[in-house]
């Protein structure tokens, strides 16, 4: 979340997230000074997760269960500060943040999961989609990544044009100051928009033992 209530309980982590965290720690121990190529690292993690047995995954699933319990426990006693629900102003004419490869993938398979499991909660649908993505090989993810990259490129052009045109009047003051803080601002926007993407997925409502939709 980055900015927000520091007292707010940390979000719950999935079994795969725990696995990736462990991978990162192992990598740091083995190569303390090496910089990590994030996409390569993610690919390797994903491939390793795919070939792990249910028994090996069990340890991480237990960690996720414990973390979920911790999160639920902490959320029971958490009181959000007043006005936390207010979202900051977003210009409706601003170019829309491009979807990630995972988001595009979700759009493909969400109807199937929801259709076959109508009683499933938004969170459970999202969890299934996450599992499916994590069990998808890099080659199979390629078309989604290609399209996401294309959309990102288009967004970057559009946002540059949008910024050049100038934002609504209130935002036009202090151009020099704005330039200095542009990089920091973009980083913050990245964070915020990742959150937005998650929210959008939830708003959209968010395995079959087998696919059970055969008529």
């Amino acid at each position: 979340m980055g900015k927000g209530d520091p007292k707010k309980p940390r979000g719950k982590m999935s079994s795969y997230a725990f696995f990736v965290q462990t991978c990162r720690e192992e990598h740091k121990k083995k190569h303390p000074d090496a910089s990590v190529n994030f996409s390569e690292f993610s690919k390797k993690c994903s491939e390793r997760w795919k070939t792990m047995s249910a028994k090996e995954k069990g340890k991480f699933e237990d960690m996720a269960k414990a973390d979920k319990a911790r999160y639920e426990r902490e959320m029971k006693t958490y009181i959000p500060p007043k006005g936390e629900t207010k979202k900051k102003f977003k210009d409706p004419n601003a170019p829309k943040r491009p979807p990630s490869a995972f988001f595009l993938f979700c759009s493909e398979y969400r109807p199937k999961i929801k259709g076959e499991h109508p009683g499933l909660s938004i969170g459970d649908v999202a969890k299934k989609l996450g599992e499916m993505w994590n069990n998808t090989a890099a080659d199979d993810k390629q078309p989604y990544e290609k399209k996401a990259a294309k959309l990102k490129e288009k967004y970057e052009k559009d946002i540059a044009a949008y910024r050049a045109k100038g934002k609504p009047d209130a935002a036009k003051k202090g151009v020099v100051k704005a330039e200095k803080s542009k990089k920091k601002k973009e980083e913050e926007e990245d964070e915020e928009d990742e959150e937005d993407e998650e929210e959008e997925e939830d708003e959209e409502d968010e395995d079959e033992e087998e696919d059970d939709d055969d008529e």
Partner: antibody
Framework: EVQLLESGGGLVQPGGSLRLSCAAS????????MHWVRQAPGKGLEWVSR????????WYADSVKGRFTISRDNSKNTLYLQMNSLRAEDTAVYYC???????????????WGQGTLVTVSS | DIQMTQSPSSLSASVGDRVTITCRAS??????LNWYQQKPGTAPKVLIY???SLQSGVPSRFSGSGSGTDFTLTISSLQPEDFSTYYC?????????FGQGTKLEIK
């Protein structure tokens, strides 16, 4: 009953084109990945192409990349394979098949159509 | 691409025999392996998916095992209708690849 029925095969000259169709029934077509798999006479099975549920994403075997195009019409419950620049080595029975997933996200092909024969010869 | 190698290519056996067909992947594929049966002039039919799960409607004399790179399909007691060609296939990544097939013939 879940069924897949291919059509459109036939005799075509090298360099020619052909469009195969696969009519699906008995399941929610728009939920599934669909594939084409071929089998040359007396030979084994070779995966050809795959398309995602909405039709927005496609995958191809190197042997057909740039020549074949997979597509689908979910409103008609139909899968297609447009084959251009056909070669003698494309001669085969072409099967359409559905990609099914287990609870652990392992994909397998079920069911398969009866196949349609494509012969590329002068 | 992941290469799938089946052995033997052909096999002669008698009704009642126990038969094992093996499949080896050129790299580790976890349990992303399926087995199909194909009778002459017909389409393939799935027998086993995810290395060891029996497809519904398939007789229990068929079983699958293995993970990583080595897999086996076992028919515990051959029946006359089992004489056909068997293929293994990996669904670990794209392109999906098949073994070259094992033809099971009557001795």
């Amino acid at each position: 009953e879940v069924q897949l029925l291919e059509s459109g095969g036939g005799l075509v000259q090298p360099g020619g084109s052909l469009r195969l169709s696969c009519a699906a029934s008995g399941f929610t077509f728009s939920y599934y990945d669909m594939h084409w798999v071929r089998q040359a006479p007396g030979k084994g099975l070779e995966w050809v192409s795959r398309i995602s549920p909405s039709g927005g994403y496609t995958w191809y075997a190197d042997s057909v990349k740039g020549r074949f195009t997979i597509s689908r019409d979910n409103s008609k419950n139909t899968l297609y394979l447009q084959m251009n620049s056909l070669r003698a080595e494309d001669t085969a029975v072409y099967y359409c098949t559905r990609g099914r997933y287990t609870s652990g996200w392992h994909e397998y092909f079920d069911p398969w159509g009866q196949g349609t024969l494509v012969t590329v010869s002068s | 691409d992941i290469q799938m190698t089946q052995s033997p290519s052909s096999l002669s056996a008698s009704v009642g025999d126990r038969v094992t067909i093996t499949c080896r992947a050129s790299q580790s594929i976890g349990t992303y392996l399926n087995w199909y049966q194909q009778k002459p002039g017909t389409a393939p039919k799935v027998l086993i998916y995810a290395a060891s799960s029996l497809q519904s409607g398939v007789p229990s004399r068929f079983s699958g095992s293995g993970s990583g790179t080595d897999f086996t399909l076992t028919i515990s007691s051959l029946q006359p209708e089992d004489f056909s060609t068997y293929y293994c296939q990996q669904s670990y990544n794209t392109p999906r690849t098949f073994g070259q097939g094992t033809k099971l013939e009557i001795k």
